[in-house]
C-alpha cells in the first residue's frame, strides 16, 4: 500500500489488478467499428478527464525519484472514473446488457484505488463534472466516450505498475 510519507505500494498486486482493469475496460467497450471523430456532444463529455502527462512523474526516472506524484495522479483518475461508472450515466436507461462487465470494472477501480490509498490517508481527488444527461441516447454516447478514455488511462497505469513491479519492488 502507498503510505503517507512515501513508502512503496504493493507493486505486484497493483500490476495484476491494473492488468485486470485493462481487460475489463476493453471488454466493456470493444472497438466495434469506430466512434465518430466529431460528435456534437463532445462539449458535454468532459474535457477534464484525467490524463497521465509528462509532468506527472510516471516516467521511469520520475518513478525512481518519487513514485508518490505518479501514484497520486493514478489514484485521482481511478476515483474519477469510479464515480462516473457509479453515476446515472451508467445506472440510468438504457440498462446495461446482462453480461456487461461495467459492474466488475467499477469494483476493480475501487479496489485498485484502495490499494493505493490506505484508510486514514486522503489524497486530493479531482472534481467530477456534473453531467446529467436527460435522454437515454445521451447517456449511451457518454458511456462509450467515458469507456474509451478509461481504456487509455488504465493502459498507461498498467504500464506504470508493470515497470514498478519489475524494477521498484523490494
Amino acid at each position: 500500500r502507498a503510505v503517507p510519507g512515501g513508502s512503496s505500494p504493493a507493486w505486484t498486486q497493483c500490476q495484476q489488478l491494473s492488468q485486470k482493469l485493462c481487460t475489463l475496460a476493453w471488454s466493456a467497450h470493444p472497438l466495434v467499428g469506430h466512434m465518430d471523430l466529431r460528435e456534437e456532444g463532445d462539449e458535454e463529455t468532459t474535457n477534464d478527464v484525467p490524463h497521465i502527462q509528462c509532468g506527472d512523474g510516471c516516467d521511469p526516472q520520475g518513478l525512481r525519484d518519487n513514485s508518490q506524484f505518479c501514484l497520486q495522479r493514478i489514484h485521482q483518475g481511478l476515483i474519477f472514473y469510479e464515480k462516473l461508472l457509479g453515476s446515472d450515466i451508467f445506472t440510468g436507461e438504457p440498462s446495461l446488457l446482462p453480461d456487461s462487465p461495467v459492474g466488475q470494472l467499477h469494483a476493480s477501480l475501487l479496489g485498485l484505488s484502495q490499494l493505493l490509498q490506505p484508510e486514514g490517508h486522503h489524497w486530493e481527488t479531482q472534481q467530477i463534472p456534473s453531467l446529467s444527461p436527460s435522454q437515454p441516447w445521451q447517456r449511451l454516447l457518454l458511456r462509450f466516450k467515458i469507456l474509451r478514455s478509461l481504456q487509455a488511462f488504465v493502459a498507461v497505469a498498467a504500464r506504470v505498475f508493470a515497470h514498478g513491479a519489475a524494477t521498484l519492488s523490494p
Epitope: D36, E39, L141
Partner: antibody, heavy 117, light 112 residues
C-alpha cells in the same frame, strides 16, 4: 461516412404488414439510437418512436402503439420497423434517422409504402 | 402533445435577398437539463430531410453561415441572410424536448 440505407418501395394490400429495414454504416452502431419518422404525401413529418441499437429498448408515440414494432440486429447493423394491419392512412414515406447527442443527425433515403385495396 | 406552428407556409424569395421563417411551440421547449431542443431541417425536392440547425442556433457541419437560428422558450426563427438557388425546399422546425417529438407543418421556400 455515416450512411443509413433503407429498403426499397413497397406496394401492399390493406390489412397486410410491411417490414422496412435501415442498414447503418460508417459509425459505431451500438452507441446510437435509431428514430423512425412518417411523412404522409403532401403532409408534414410525424415521429413514430425510437429503438436503442445497444439493448433494443424502444419507445413509441402513443398514436403508433400496436401499429409499429421496432427491432434491431446488431450483427448486420440493421434496424427494422414492422407496420401491421395496414390501411390507406399508412400510405407514406417512412424514414429512419440516427439520433445524435442533441438531435437526429443523419437520415435514410426513405421507404415509400403504398397500401392498395 | 406540443404543437409546432410554422409561418409562413410558402415563402417566395429572390436570390440574394434575405428570408425568415417563424416557429412557435405551444409550450416552452426549455428542458430540465437547461438546453432547448429546437431543431431545423431542410428537405430538398425528392430528397430525405437534412439537419441544418440543432439546439436553436448551432449549425450542422457543412451548413453555410448565411443560416442562423435564434429564439428561446416558445418563439424561434430561422433566417437566411442571402438566399441561394440550393436553398429551395421544405423547411421544418421540430422539438425534441417533450415526447412525442413533434414537427412544424413546414415552410416551402421557392425562388422568385
Amino acid at each position: 461516412e455515416v450512411q443509413l440505407q433503407q429498403s426499397g418501395p413497397e406496394l401492399v394490400k390493406t390489412g397486410a404488414s410491411v417490414n422496412i429495414s435501415c442498414k447503418a454504416s460508417g459509425y459505431s452502431f451500438t452507441a446510437y439510437y435509431i428514430q423512425w419518422v412518417k411523412q404522409s404525401r403532401g403532409k408534414s413529418l410525424e415521429w413514430i418512436g425510437y429503438i436503442s441499437c445497444y439493448n433494443g429498448a424502444t419507445r413509441y408515440n402513443q398514436k403508433f402503439k400496436g401499429k409499429a414494432t421496432f427491432t434491431v440486429d446488431t450483427s448486420s447493423r440493421t434496424a427494422y420497423m414492422q407496420f401491421s394491419s395496414l390501411t390507406s392512412e399508412d400510405s407514406a414515406v417512412y424514414f429512419c434517422a440516427r439520433q445524435g447527442f442533441y438531435a437526429m443527425d443523419y437520415w435514410g433515403q426513405g421507404t415509400s409504402v403504398t397500401v392498395s385495396s | 402533445n406540443v404543437v409546432m406552428t410554422q409561418t409562413p407556409l410558402t415563402l417566395s424569395v429572390t436570390i440574394g435577398q434575405p428570408a425568415s421563417i417563424s416557429c412557435k411551440s405551444s409550450q416552452s421547449l426549455l428542458d430540465s437539463d437547461g438546453k432547448t431542443y429546437l431543431n431545423w431541417l431542410l428537405q430538398r425536392p425528392g430528397q430525405s430531410p437534412k439537419r441544418l440547425i440543432y439546439l436553436v442556433s448551432k449549425l450542422d457541419s457543412g451548413v453555410p453561415d448565411r443560416f442562423t437560428g435564434s429564439g428561446s422558450g416558445t418563439d424561434f426563427t430561422l433566417k437566411i441572410s442571402r438566399v441561394e438557388a440550393e436553398d429551395l425546399g421544405l423547411y421544418y422546425c421540430w422539438q425534441g424536448t417533450h415526447f412525442p417529438f413533434t414537427f412544424g407543418s413546414g415552410t416551402k421556400l421557392e425562388i422568385k
